[in-house]
Amino acid sequence: EPPTACREKQYLINSQCCSLCQPGQKLVSDCTEFTETECLPCSESEFLDTWNRETRCHQHKYCDPNLGLQVQQKGTSETDTICTCEEGLHCTSESCESCVPHRSCLPGFGVKQIATGVSDTICEPCPVGFFSNVSSAFEKCRPWTSCETKDLVVQQAGTNKTDVVCGPQDRQR
């Protein structure tokens, strides 16, 4: 009696179970009563990453330098090419189809996490005792200067954007 279901890594065709093609190979011809499934390897610029019955392989992703992309990992017959972004840029999506410049943290904010090829800069507001007076994609919030350690006194209080201003202590004669 012809099968109605097949084992894992097989498919049902013409009332018989044929082996799927292994990753990196495409289907050329179904199995017959005389032969196993005919499969052939994907070409150098192509891949298939699963056990399959695809009659054509998928084209490797192209990392377009005009979009700021570069190859992070070259594709094989079983894996797609992985793109990442050039220095100073990050991916706009998980599939990394294009890149945008890293965000800078405005004055009053510091860098919590420096951007990578796949993630943008993460900024955080400078807490009390810290400041940032620049727009930067790298600089963290810096602590206010400690006037006391310099034997000075605070002449002007600091903010999240400015450092304290220290001055000499008033000497009582």
């Epitope: 013409n14 011809s29 179904d30 017959t32 019955r53 009659t55």
Partner: antibody
Framework: EVQLEESGGDLVQPGASLRLSCAAS????????MSWVRQAPGKGLEWVAS?????????YYASWAKGRFTISKDTSKTTLYLQMNSLRAEDTATYFC?????????WGQGTLVTVSS | DIQMTQSPSSLSASVGDRVTITCQAS??????LAWYQQKPGQAPKLLIY???KLASGVPSRFSGSGSGTDFTLTISSLQPEDFATYYC????????????FGQGTKVVIK
Amino acid sequence: EVQLEESGGDLVQPGASLRLSCAASGFDFNSNAMSWVRQAPGKGLEWVASIYAGGSGSTYYASWAKGRFTISKDTSKTTLYLQMNSLRAEDTATYFCARGITRLPLWGQGTLVTVSS
Amino acid sequence: DIQMTQSPSSLSASVGDRVTITCQASQSISSYLAWYQQKPGQAPKLLIYDASKLASGVPSRFSGSGSGTDFTLTISSLQPEDFATYYCQGTYYGSTTISAFGQGTKVVIK
């Protein structure tokens, strides 16, 4: 029943054109590559052309067949074709269609093409 | 194109003999090699594919070996029904696909 049946063979004059057909039945025509092989009277087998399965339908030819012969298929009719142009006396042969490329487990019985003036 | 050189072109043997036919490809074809048997007035019949896999229903006295450029078909003990012509078919698969058959080996009764 799984079978291939060729037709279209004829006696033609040199320079003429002819289209051979191969009707496939009993299997999924769309997921199988197909080939044409010929055999001149009393001679050996000679690969002519192959066409890949599915939408890609990439075609490949023996160097002597390029430009003169064209392999094609009509999935809706489950039929394989071989268009032969500018026929020569040396094209006289039985033409077989077969399923597959690197191995040919299923063959038709062949159709005879005779090129003679 | 690839060339498949098959030898011998003919051989005479007796029932029970061990018969060996060789096939050489003009360039490496990995294991994309098949062997066929053809009897007069019939279409060829597939015996061996992928150089060494026996097609279902083919007697186990037939075996194939080799890879790259050199291949062999062996009939371990020739039977009366084995007198026929044998062909190898090699396929080069790379940037293009090209197939070719050997010239054939006619096995006749001694």
